[in-house]
């Protein structure tokens, strides 16, 4: 498919100009390259009529110009003096005229209206409003007034002062006569629709002494707006409708066949199944202006979009619209990255987010995608140094591996943490990810204690053990801060015998706190990684308190170490062995921590999209 | 919501130094940016300076920078405003601003030094530096 986008028809009247933009994908050797503007014939040539080499067909000498916009991906052509002969199919494109990296653009040229003398002119958009003004004489103010539609040959009333209103208007239309001081009146059609386009004559009086006034009604069709977004990237509809309809429903739908336009999402809450956890709506302004971003572009996303205004959030004859043409390019810059990733519960997942290399310096964030309200995606952690609370211990942000990717760490995964999260930087708009966690069936990879207590002064080694699938994996352990996890030395204490059907390649690596002080209080992980990318970690809280009684000392230690097979040693030395790996309660599946996630999260129950862009918790 | 209260304002000659706190309560586990604005009479709310809740970066107006310094105690859920070399021009009511995390995709592009950024405001304190 040519990555050549441009307005599929271009409507003018004969006199006018047109200016047509046609996007390519701003590579450097596109960017460089000739780009033209040519005929169709009947047999399939395309006759160059102007080129960004210079060239200019004597057809459009003095009338005609092409310029290229290389920063953009655009050139754009324009043409003057516009007569029914320039009707026809054109192509833009770039290179020769016969490669096929060109877009069809049909262009139309009709006959200026035929008026007569002294004909107001009303151009208006569909769905808008227009007032038609309408004078008369002193001797006929107490006259009847009345709007008259030319249909064919006979003038049809459409309404008039003694109450009448034409069915086809009903509930849209009204007469309004003005204060004795003005000798006018004025019709008010609300919801315009296209069928309303025509020759009215309004009327005082009905006899051979009335004043009479022509108008010619124009409804447009909102031209589209040509948007050029890559695949994998995001797009932005901003809809500004007015004022008049603030307080009225929204909607965002695309264009299927023929007239139907199916909702996308609107203000009641409504959202198209094939855009869950990618689509956000972001509330309208005091004067009814409303955006809604979509992002993870899909090449069945392109085509025709409206967005309006109407009390059932979806399109209705007279609904006021916007339009835009989406094309979205497969040659895109943004690379493949996972849209969904599966843990387990108790495990974790580790997500990479995509990001445009030219802005390393930018702050990234990951957010949870809120499909309640369609307008939210509330922080969760960013690359400045903040984590939500609800999320302290168990959620980091890496500028790893970098270089246009940066890593967000989840562990102690609930089924609460299954849902849709979007990576965003605060550079360029259009590079923003979703990705599904998926919470499986399964057990957490690495096995750690549950949460640990440390006596101040004395020495905790605690394990952390990793089955044989990691046996090429780089393992470590580090201690969790709001700004991320710094690495701590930690002793590779041989095999494990945590793991049933797992050889002498599975590891016991151990992390050794020398004389606990209070600093050493927190969240400490243990984990896996390949160079710069990472992979499952596991988290243990190390609390620290004060050396007890000798009397309560072994009871003590015992229950507040969930341990039960921890050995206190007499040099002050204590080990958790955790040989009883089996044991359930020595396992953080569900922490406190998770509990005290923020209620009004709410259950978020995961939507399958059947995405082949998958990935485990512990893969890359 | 959050609230935000100021002290340390006062009377002071120019050159001298001053040190205001903002203490906020509330739901503070919201907080994302912390900041200081200003205002002169007759003129607008002026940014001043602005702290990153979580790692600490900081923001300054040009106006300012090299003579304020903003610094916050998490602990305390403090932010603070040391002003050294203090100027006549520098007089004006200082407030105390606080950012929530952002939620709407909006949120994410605004930057903290614009006023439209901050979801609560104190009710701010008296700076006078005379000549």
């Known amino acids: 498919k040519s990555p050549i986008f441009g307005p599929e028809e271009v409507n003018s009247v004969e006199g006018n100009s047109v200016s047509i933009t046609c996007y390519y994908p701003p590579t450097s050797v596109n960017r460089h390259t000739r780009k033209y503007w040519c005929r169709q014939g009947a047999r399939g040539g395309c006759i160059t009529l102007i080129s960004s080499e210079g060239y200019v067909s004597s057809k459009y000498a003095g009338r005609a110009n092409l310029t290229n916009f290389p920063e953009n991906g655009t050139f754009v052509v324009n043409i003057a003096q516009l007569s029914q002969d320039d009707s026809g199919r054109y192509k833009c494109g770039l290179g020769i005229n016969s490669r096929g990296l060109s877009f069809d653009v049909s262009l139309e040229v009709s006959q200026g209206p035929g008026l007569l003398n002294d004909t107001k002119v009303y151009t208006v958009d569909l769905g808008r409003t227009v007032t038609i003004n309408c004078p008369f004489k002193t001797e006929n103010a107490q006259k009847r007034k009345s709007l008259y539609k030319q249909i064919g040959l006979y003038p049809v009333l459409v309404i008039d002062s003694s109450g009448y209103v034409n069915p086809n208007y009903t509930g849209r239309i009204r007469l309004d006569i003005q204060g004795t001081g003005q000798l006018l009146f004025s019709v008010v059609i609300n919801q315009l629709r296209l069928s309303d386009a025509g020759q009215y004559l309004c009327q005082a009086g009905d006899d051979s002494n009335s004043n009479k006034k022509n108008a010619d009604l124009q409804v447009l069709k909102p031209e589209p707006e040509l948007v050029y977004e890559d695949l994998r990237g995001s797009v932005t509809f901003h809809c500004a409708l007015g004022p008049e309809v603030a307080n009225v429903a929204k909607f965002l739908c695309r264009q299927s066949s023929g007239e139907n336009c199916d909702v996308v999402v609107n203000t009641l809450g409504k959202r198209a199944p094939a855009f869950e956890g990618r689509i956000l709506l972001n509330p309208q302004d005091k004067d009814g202006s409303f955006s809604v971003v979509i992002t993870g572009l899909r090449k069945e996303d392109a085509g025709r979009y409206l967005c309006g205004a109407h009390s059932d959030g979806q399109l209705q004859e007279g609904s006021p619209i916007q339009a835009w043409q989406l094309f979205v390019n497969e040659e895109s810059t943004i690379p493949r990255s996972p849209t969904v990733v599966k843990g387990v519960a108790g495990g974790s997942v580790a997500v990479l987010c995509p990001y445009n290399r030219k802005e390393s310096k930018s702050i990234k964030y990951w957010c949870l995608w809120e499909g309640a309200q369609n307008g939210r995606c509330p922080l969760l952690v960013d690359s400045e140094g903040w984590v939500k609370a609800q999320y302290e211990g168990r959620l980091s942000l890496l500028e790893e591996p970098g270089n246009g990717t940066f890593t967000v760490i989840l562990n102690q995964l609930t089924s609460r943490d299954a849902g849709f999260y979007w990576c965003l930087t605060n550079g360029d708009t259009l590079w923003r990810t979703t990705v599904e966690i998926k919470i499986i069936e399964g057990e957490p990879n690495l096995k750690v204690p549950g949460n640990v207590t440390a006596v101040l002064g004395e020495t905790l080694k605690v394990p952390c053990h990793f089955p044989c699938k990691f046996s090429s994996y780089e393992k470590y352990w580090c201690k969790w801060n709001n700004t991320g996890c710094q690495a701590l030395p930690s002793q590779d204490e041989g095999p494990s015998k945590a793991f049933v059907n797992c050889d002498e390649n599975s590891r016991l690596v151990s992390l050794t706190l020398n004389l606990v002080t209070r600093a050493d209080e927190g969240w400490y992980w243990c984990g896996v990684k390949q160079g710069h990318f990472y992979g499952e970690t596991a988290a243990v809280y190390v609390a620290v308190e004060e050396r007890k009684a000798a009397g309560s000392r072994d009871v003590s230690l015992a229950k507040a170490d969930a341990a039960p097979d921890e050995k206190v040693l007499d040099s002050g030395f204590r080990e958790i062995e955790n040989k009883a790996i089996q044991d359930p309660r020595l396992f953080a599946e569900e922490k406190a921590v998770a509990d005290t996630r923020d209620q009004a999260d709410g259950s978020r129950a995961s939507v399958d999209s059947g995405s082949s862009e998958e990935q485990g918790g512990s893969s890359r | 919501q959050v609230q935000l209260v100021e002290s340390g304002g006062g009377l002071v000659q120019a050159g001298d130094s001053l040190r205001l706190s903002c203490a906020a309560s509330?739901?503070?586990?919201?907080?994302?940016?912390m900041g200081w604005f200003r205002q002169a009479p007759g003129q607008e709310r002026e940014f001043v300076a602005a702290i990153h809740w979580g790692g600490g970066r900081t923001y300054y107006a040009d106006s300012v920078k090299g003579r304020f310094t903003i610094s916050r105690d998490n602990a305390k859920n403090t932010v603070y405003l040391q002003m050294n070399s203090l100027e006549p021009g520098d007089t004006a009511n200082y407030y105390c601003a606080a950012r929530r995390a952002p939620e709407l995709l909006d949120d994410y592009k605004q930057k903290p030094e614009e006023i439209g950024a901050y979801h609560y405001w104190g009710q701010g304190t008296q700076v006078t530096v005379s000549s």
């Open positions: 509330g739901r503070t586990s919201s907080l994302y940016n």
